[in-house]
Interface confidence: low
């Protein structure tokens, strides 16, 4: 039989669980999605990002005893940025100055942009499977931040008895993953 | 070592409930789910359904959905079956088991000692 | 769901002898992934079940040599070598490839 029961889990919340050894897989993988320009005389410490930094991640959803049966691929929208419009001013010297000096009171973030629910399922070590909503990001933005800005951007929202997933250990995987767990 | 310990031997009327206990140890208590198997006297093994120990969220055999409940108590490390409006096709055995890996593809390793309910008028 | 037969259901033997008992599935046990989840489990008189052979012929810790399995798609064999005292008690065999995970009726095995 298969459990059907929807629940509702926000992939920020869960850890990737490690594949089977004989997987290629790699999790976690991220590749740097941003164009990045020097920032030597503004900010020596860092590198002013063009646009918004897109970290492309594949990792696997588990409720902690369920796992799913293939990776999640999606965006993670990360650290600073420069609004595309203000480029040209960046490039000529003028607004970027001015910009990166009030960086105290406020700042440019990526943040996420456009996501969609889409139904993963969960393989089970009884051989049941579980049908879980995830929010997956597909498009990053570059918003502005003052310092009172709270980013909270999800809540999670339980439509079933189940805990919200946690981080958790990760552990080993006696099988393959594919369309049946094992008892 | 790892051991799952069963509540002691329970006589009950029909119509009544009985809770059984099932206290594991030697393991990390919410990485293993729990499953439940029943034997009636006489009989071969009937799987129940298992709860997920770490979520908390039960599965259920078909045969087994309605009066029958499965649940935690993560601090103490125990689940517990509980059975409604007992039967007198209750009188069983009932163990709880545990996988010998993550996924338990390489069979059912570890048991409890098996907790017999006797249903009787 | 998945029914396995067992046969005999009955089995006496002489200590010494090899003992063999078969199971079979009204469908294939062999998993998607490649691997075939069938096991055979001991009961002993007053006991639980213990776990002897998993995923059809790998013995599970502490079991003698004396014990294995075979088989492939629906049909499927325990051999026991040769049958001490101790191997007395019923058999199941059992999968988990599919849901929900099924038993065997078991096979007793007893003294002639």
């Known amino acids: 039989f298969k459990n059907d029961a929807t629940e509702i889990l926000y992939s920020h919340v869960v850890k990737p669980v490690p594949a089977h050894p004989s997987s290629n897989s790699t999790l976690n993988q991220a590749r740097n999605g941003g164009r990045h320009f020097s920032s030597t005389g503004l900010d020596r410490n860092s590198r002013v990002q063009v646009g918004c930094r897109e970290l492309r991640s594949t990792k696997y959803i588990s409720d902690g005893q369920c796992t799913s049966i293939s990776p999640l691929k999606e965006l993670v929208c990360a650290g600073e940025c420069l609004p595309l419009p203000v480029l040209p001013n960046w490039i000529g010297g003028g607004y970027g100055t001015k910009y990166w000096s009030r960086r105290s009171s406020q700042e440019w973030r990526c943040v996420n942009d456009k996501t969609r629910t889409q139904r993963i399922q969960l393989q089970c070590q009884d051989g049941s499977t579980r049908t879980y909503k995830i929010t997956v990001v597909t498009a990053c933005k570059c918003k502005r931040y003052t310092r009172q800005h709270n980013e909270s951007s999800h809540n999670f929202e339980s439509v079933s008895p189940a805990k919200p997933a946690q981080h958790h250990r990760e552990r080993k995987r006696a099988s393959k993953s594919s369309k049946h767990s094992l008892s | 070592q790892i051991h799952l310990v069963q509540s002691g031997p329970e006589l009950k009327k029909p119509g009544e409930t009985v809770k059984i206990s099932c206290k594991a140890s030697g393991f990390s208590f919410t990485t293993y789910g729990m499953s439940w198997v029943k034997q009636a006297p006489g009989k071969g093994l009937k799987w129940m359904g298992w709860?997920?120990?770490?979520?908390?969220?039960?599965t259920y055999a078909d045969d087994f959905k309605g009066r029958f409940a499965f649940s935690l108590e993560t601090s103490a490390s125990t689940a517990y079956l509980q059975i409604n409006n007992l039967k007198n096709e209750d009188t069983a055995t009932y163990f709880c088991?545990?996988?010998?890996?993550?996924?338990?593809?390489?069979?059912?390793?570890?048991w409890g000692q098996g907790t017999l309910v006797t249903v009787s008028a | 769901d998945v029914v396995m037969t067992q046969t005999p259901l009955s089995l006496p033997v002489s200590l010494g002898d090899q003992a063999s008992i078969s199971c079979r599935s009204s469908q294939s046990l062999e998993h998607s992934n490649g691997n075939t989840y069938l096991h055979w489990y001991l009961q002993k008189p007053g006991q639980s079940p213990k776990l002897l052979i998993y995923k059809v012929s790998n013995r599970f810790s502490g079991v003698p040599d004396r014990f294995s399995g075979s088989g492939s798609g629906t049909d499927f064999t325990l051999k026991i070598s040769r049958v001490e005292a101790e191997d007395l008690g019923v058999y199941f065999c059992?999968?988990?490839?599919?849901?929900?995970?099924?038993f065997g009726a078991g096979t007793k095995v007893e003294l002639k």
């Open positions: 709860i997920n120990t770490y979520s908390g969220v039960p």
């Open positions: 088991v545990r996988g010998r890996e993550y996924y338990y593809g390489s069979g059912i390793a570890f």
């Open positions: 059992s999968q988990s490839t599919h849901v929900p995970l099924t």
